[in-house]
Interface confidence: low
């Protein structure tokens, strides 16, 4: 049977009553159209919700939006387009809502034809109240925020400009023209680059990159012959034509560009890309794409400069450039990634890592399921996620992988149980320790949402039909209840809860549909009084993560260390809580093999910690470049994982010789970079 | 016990320099993101510099910047404040202090005295 | 840089009085405010964080509260060992900045 039928399943007391004082209805006074919703702040509770509806007219489109506001997580909304005196905004470029809790929202309205320029409304004050601002340009993006300082926003416009203002959007100024991409890094820098022959596209490949630390006051070039760049936990990324052909490398720098080094990492053609998969202090995941339409490409790991690389997992299927591939960060579990591959069969298969990518498996089969027709053997077969690339195909797919950082463990994803993906109908399938053990959770897709940072999840079930009812489930997926919040089922469009998972409030969004009319509606839903008192001390349990084999002295070491979580007992029906802080207790690992990655020439063969040299490049000599230099690299094949922690143990010991010798291939030298001031 | 001890303070002369350590003990050292901040003769504080748990990020008030540098150890559980270039205005008790993961400044060394005169 | 105002600069108080700090904001801060304790050759003390949250702890006599650019940090029934200094600081953006403190002395 599935899971919550099962008679053991304890039920939640007078739940029905509980939830019913708690659920609100809004009816928004709104023709169908489209919304879109946007929290503005942590554990503010404020809400902005933007409807906009197209009338083709015959000559041109009518548009009209209007914006409402809830300020106690959606139970109640306030109709406040007034506050931006009836103005249709643009919703292609959604509520640009400032970082942290700085409480600001930059919206963008539409303006007429003839116009010099476009128009935005700002708020600081968490949407209580709006200022117009005529723009001296026509944005062809959306305000950016610089991540240190919410004062600052930059903004490309419609002619290629890069402008810039200082205080929230109240004063623009253009600090560059010729501009195809602009980006914010650290300390209130901007990263662009520029063209000189005309256009952005015309000039793939021979742009500039540029850099002023100073918001427009002094520039530098950074780079020449750029196609494109990137920024990623504290790297920066540029993909650099080859001077004799139409090839290109990447190349890293850790100094805001003052800098640059080659990474270790195969070229691409023309028709290849390069993709940053994730990124963060330590370290880079990097996919370059294989030659040809394949459709997949491999991942690599990079040390902690970002320079040298080592082959982390083949045929990582991600399709062409900007398109779809399931790497999914498990935000749950430190060191965590999911992905598929796309085997020599054209099958696509799920595999995780544990290790910040040093070695991937197959995810166990669940113990509660059968393998389905794609298994050569009944009893031998795996669990395959669903993500990004089954809902770009259009599969019965309605939600990505979910994990929570504060509800440690938890991953809920739709999944099928073979050899690899079926586009049969999905099922819904939880890990409680992030991804080693699986179990069916719910029967067929659904939507779902973490809340109370694990404390409660809650799904509604996917389905053409409307619908009334809503699961919840306090012990992590085990056991499920029903709640009809509505007697009129409403046309589902989704879920919505605050970011964070730390909310017991979840909004139900739907229309309704009459002979005459649709309208927006959305159900709010107050989850507290079934969660009614706070928990304790008795209410945790102490949780070793990583852990595989519990006699094992070394048992949880994950890069170099361990950690013991507190977690909240299952059958504990309580609340962690707003304030709730995830408890843990690290402790350091002696290091081993796994606490080192294959270096640069070295690869591991399946089954085995061991490295080995690539047969090909046996017997010569590895040279990279290092900030410009040509560098000799001396190593018995190992280098420690970027964040690994371990100390004493297994120590391989790995030295790099400093040749002196000019890079001929780096086309970022120091030399050739300048300087101007405004 | 969670304890922070500050020490490296001194008499130094302007345009001099001087080398502020903080050892710490009693937390996981190496999970905390660490500040300095100092607090003038007239009791008025100034937050200084900021360095992450990893140590990748760092940032500083304007005050400070390109003269002082924030560093750690954690291996050694210690937290470094290099200050060249130092100016009478520098004179101050310069405290280490803990980020956790509610807020900036939930534990606090007992400061050390640095004084810049001729 | 936010600025921020801490009145007043002292109070008098006695044993079991209700006292109150403010501290104004020169921008909203939404709750990115804390409350610190210094006592003379004491280390600085969390009271306070987020506006409103007790650290572990702290007496419960403490309380904050306020959001946006105003808040507030009262001491419902002032005790013998509350004699202090006492400081809010902003961790909304950087630079992150202090109150110029308010000095809690006896009657």
């Known amino acids: 049977s599935a899971p919550g039928e099962d008679e053991e399943c304890g039920r939640v007391r007078d739940f029905v009553a509980k939830l019913a004082n708690n659920t609100h209805q809004h009816v928004f006074d709104d023709l169908r159209g489209s919304v879109s919703l946007s929290w503005v702040g942590d554990s503010t509770g404020v809400i902005l919700v933007l409807t906009t509806f197209h009338v083709p007219l015959v000559i041109m489109t009518f548009g009209q939006s209007k914006l409402y506001r809830s300020e106690d997580y959606g139970k109640n909304f306030k109709d406040i387009t007034d506050l931006i005196n009836n103005t249709f905004i643009r919703t292609e470029f959604g509520m640009a809502i400032g970082p942290e809790n700085s409480g600001k929202v930059v919206l963008t309205a539409e303006v007429s034809g003839g116009s010099r320029g476009g128009r935005i409304f700002r708020s600081s004050d968490f949407a209580k109240n709006f200022v117009q601002t005529d723009l001296p340009f026509h944005p062809l993006t959306q305000m950016m925020y610089s991540p240190q300082n919410s004062d600052y926003l930059l903004a490309l416009s419609t002619e290629n400009g890069l402008w810039v203002s200082k205080n929230f959007g109240g004063k623009w100024e253009e600090i560059h023209k010729a501009v195809c991409l602009a980006k914010w890094g650290s300390d209130n820098t901007i990263f662009f680059t520029t063209y000189a022959n005309g256009s952005c596209k015309a000039d793939l490949g021979a742009l500039e990159l540029w850099r002023t630390s100073d918001l427009g006051k002094s520039f530098k070039t950074i780079g020449v012959k750029i196609y494109s760049f990137g920024l990623g936990g504290r790297f920066l990324f540029a993909s650099v034509m080859a001077d004799k052909d139409t090839t290109r490398r990447i190349h890293v720098s850790t100094d805001q560009g003052d800098t640059w080094s080659m990474a270790q990492l195969p070229s691409v053609g023309q028709e290849q890309f390069y993709s940053i998969l994730a990124a963060n202090d330590d370290m880079v995941f990097m996919h370059v794409d294989e030659p040809g339409d394949t459709g997949f490409g491999t991942i690599f790991t990079s040390d902690d400069r970002g320079i040298v690389y080592s082959k982390s997992l083949d045929r990582h299927l991600y399709t062409t450039t900007g398109g779809e591939t399931d790497f999914t960060n498990v935000t749950s579990l430190r060191g965590v990634y999911i992905t598929s591959v796309l085997s020599e069969d054209n099958s696509i298969q799920t595999m995780i890592t544990f290790d910040q990518g040093g070695r991937w498996t197959h995810l166990r089969k669940p113990e509660n399921s059968e393998c389905d027709a794609t298994a050569k053997n009944k009893n031998e077969c795996s669990l395959h996620i669903h993500a990004s690339y089954s809902i770009s195909q259009k599969l019965n797919v309605p939600m990505a992988p979910l994990s929570e950082p504060n509800a440690v463990g938890i991953v809920i994803a739709h999944g099928s149980v073979g050899d690899a993906i079926s586009v049969m109908v999905p099922d819904v399938y939880i890990s409680d320790d992030g991804g080693y053990s699986w179990t069916k959770m719910l029967e067929g897709p659904h939507y779902y949402t973490i809340l109370d940072s694990g404390g409660i999840i809650v799904a509604i079930e996917h389905s053409s039909r409307p619908i009334n009812v809503i699961k919840f489930s306090t012990d992590e997926g085990q056991c499920w209840q029903t709640y009809t919040f509505t007697r009129d089922p409403i046309y589902f469009t989704g879920l919505a809860s605050e970011p964070g998972a730390r909310s017991m409030n979840i909004s139900i969004w739907g229309f309704t549909e009459s002979f005459l009319t649709s309208q927006w509606v959305s159900y709010t839903i107050d989850f507290k009084d079934i969660l009614e008192r706070n928990c304790e001390e008795k209410d945790y349990t102490i949780w070793l993560a990583h852990s595989t084999d519990p006699e094992d002295y070394e048992d949880g070491c994950i890069l170099g260390y361990k950690e013991q979580f507190l977690r909240l007992r299952k059958s504990s029906v309580c609340q962690n809580g707003r304030d709730y802080v995830v408890t843990k207790q690290p402790s350091i690992c002696l290091c081993s093999l796994e606490d080192f990655l294959c270096d640069f020439g070295y690869y591991r063969p399946e089954n085995d910690s061991k490295c080995v040299e690539q047969p090909e490049l046996k017997g010569h000599d590895l040279e990279f470049c290092l900030y410009g230099r040509e560098e000799h690299l001396t190593t018995n094949g190992y280098r420690k994982i970027p964040g690994d922690k371990c100390q004493g143990g297994v120590n391989p010991v790995r030295e790099v010789k400093d040749l002196k010798k000019k890079c001929t291939s780096n086309f970022l030298s120091p030399e050739k970079q300048n300087s101007k001031s405004n | 016990e969670v304890q922070l001890v500050e020490s490296g303070g001194g008499l130094v002369q302007p345009g001099g320099s001087l080398r502020l350590s903080c050892a710490a003990s009693?937390?996981?050292?190496?999970?905390?993101?660490m500040s300095w901040v100092r607090q003038a003769p007239d009791k008025r504080l100034e937050w200084v510099a900021i360095?992450?748990?990893?140590?990748?990020?760092?940032y500083y008030s304007d005050t400070v910047k390109g003269r002082f540098t924030i560093s750690r150890d954690n291996s050694k559980n210690s937290l470094y404040l290099q200050m060249n270039s130092l100016k009478a205005e520098d004179t101050a008790v310069y405290y280490c202090?803990?980020?956790?993961?509610?807020?900036?400044?939930?534990?606090w060394g007992q400061g050390t005295l640095v004084t810049v005169s001729s | 840089d936010i600025q921020m105002t801490q009145s007043p600069s002292s109070v008098s108080a006695s044993v079991g009085d209700r006292v109150t700090i403010t501290c104004h904001a020169s921008?909203?801060?939404?709750?990115?405010i804390g409350w610190l304790q210094q006592k003379p050759g004491k280390a600085f003390k969390g009271l306070i964080y987020?506006?409103?949250n007790l650290k572990d702890g702290v007496p419960s006599r403490f309380s904050g509260s306020g959001s946006g650019a105003d808040f507030t940090l009262t001491i419902s029934s002032l005790q013998p060992e509350d004699f202090a200094d006492y400081f809010c600081?902003?961790?909304?953006?950087?630079?992150?900045?202090f109150g110029q403190g308010t000095k809690v002395e006896k009657r």
């Open positions: 202090s803990r980020s956790s993961s509610h807020w900036y400044f939930d534990v």
């Open positions: 009693g937390f996981t050292f190496s999970t905390y993101g």
């Open positions: 360095i992450s748990s990893g140590g990748s990020y760092t």
């Open positions: 921008q909203g801060i939404s709750s990115n």
């Open positions: 987020h506006g409103t």
């Open positions: 600081v902003q961790y909304a953006q950087f630079p992150y900045t």
